[in-house]
């Protein structure tokens, strides 16, 4: 019996193939077997089917990196990592995706979901689209909507200063941030740490953060979660 999706293009298709355990999977951009990409799939949060593209959990990985590193990705997908802007751009170009952000700190948890999420191509400097908030963490990403990505060596923000340089991270900075999930782990100095402004403010570095995406219509597809 064949798989419903022999070359799953994201974690939702892997899940619809019957894979329900969170972990490493191979997906294929546009279902093209020549465009394989190893990703970490979260198969449990809110129904599962999420490609995790950022994880902060212990500060072992250096996130103060240059443009090339953020374009291509870095880290261990089982631990702390960034999947890469090129990958995010290609994945979100496949269709309509939603974003989920999970935050945890000392037994507390919060989340944010955005109905519409995409990352533009390299020419747009990976311009962010994030709309349609719901959740408990507060709508901090809205401030960054429409911004290009910024690193210390490619300053695309609207501030006089270089936001990535000032806050030792990288993000879709504006002037400068409400969200700084690639900030300095454990740094509680103002705006320097792993911040989600509307949950813990700028003077508190959050212990655990994940950003993940899945197709916006995943709920409609769930009924097909079985082998063909």
């Amino acid at each position: 019996i064949g798989l419903l999706y022999p070359f799953p293009r994201d974690c939702s298709q892997a899940m619809l193939n019957g894979d329900t355990t969170s972990g490493l999977y191979t997906i294929y951009i546009n279902g093209d077997k020549t465009q394989a990409l190893e990703v970490y799939c979260d198969m449990t949060s809110d129904g599962g089917g999420w490609i995790v593209f950022l994880r902060r959990k212990n500060g072992r990985e250096d996130f103060y990196r240059n443009w090339k590193a953020y374009a291509t990705g870095f880290g261990d997908r089982r631990e702390e990592f960034w999947l890469g802007l090129d990958n995010l751009s290609k994945i979100t170009a496949q269709g309509q995706y939603e974003l989920r952000v999970d935050l945890q700190d000392h037994g507390e948890s919060a989340y944010a979901v955005y109905d519409r999420f995409s990352v533009g191509d390299a020419k747009s400097r990976y311009k962010l689209k994030v709309e349609g908030y719901s959740g408990t963490a507060g709508d901090s990403m809205n401030y960054h909507n429409g911004r290009s990505f910024s690193t210390y060596d490619k300053d695309t923000d609207s501030a006089i200063t270089n936001c990535a340089l000032s806050y030792k991270g990288a993000f879709w900075y504006k002037n400068c941030h409400r969200v700084n999930l690639m900030g300095r782990y454990g740094d509680n100095n103002h705006s320097q740490g792993v911040n989600w402004f509307h949950w813990k403010g700028h003077e508190y570095s959050i212990q655990f953060a994940e950003m993940k995406l899945r197709p916006s219509n995943f709920r409609n597809l769930e009924g097909r979660r079985k082998r063909a």
Partner: antibody, heavy 120, light 107 residues
Amino acid sequence: QVQLVESGGGLVQPGRSLRLSCAASGFTFDDYAMHWVRQAPGKGLEWVSGISGSGGSTYYADSVKGRFTISRDNAKNSLYLQMNSLRAEDTALYYCAKVMSSMEDAFDIWGQGTMVTVSS
Amino acid sequence: DIQMTQSPASLPTPVGDRVTITCRASQYIQGFLNWYQQKPGKAPKLLIYDASNLETGVPSRFSGSGSGTDFTLTISSLQPEDFATYYCQQSYSTPQTFGQGTKVDIK
């Protein structure tokens, strides 16, 4: 062009109510948070209240909390401010304002204002 | 709440002179600072957003600078139409607060 037009102001006795309206045109209304800002005669600007694009989140200055209610009708491209238990110190020109993008952002478009006078 | 303190309160200035208005926040606000111009009987008009970004249509003689807690609005060469009251506003957190205003009038 982008425009905001306030209405509903007037003379009202202390303790009474008034409802201000703001009619928006020239932009996709439900994409933007909206705010009310007031200015007492001869004084500076004071932020009063704000509401998210969907209407799901509302915010108030301490001075009006529990007395004023901000709301919006996206189908009618309209913003409202229901003002109850009015006090003399609420006397001001009330402006509605549109944000540039996010909830906490600069106000790039302002209405011409509507005057509220609270006096016996 | 974040307090915004503007100085000076009044600034009599001849046409053609350089004008500098300062605004100080009671706590760190990154660059979430905006400047408005208000003329008598008119609504405020946005000049500068995010500390240094010139709003569309605003003359280039206006500029903004600063970050953190201290900010400046500069008019490089004051024109007759610039006589007005100027307000700073923090958009860092709710409630958004304004400075008390600086009145620029003719000397």
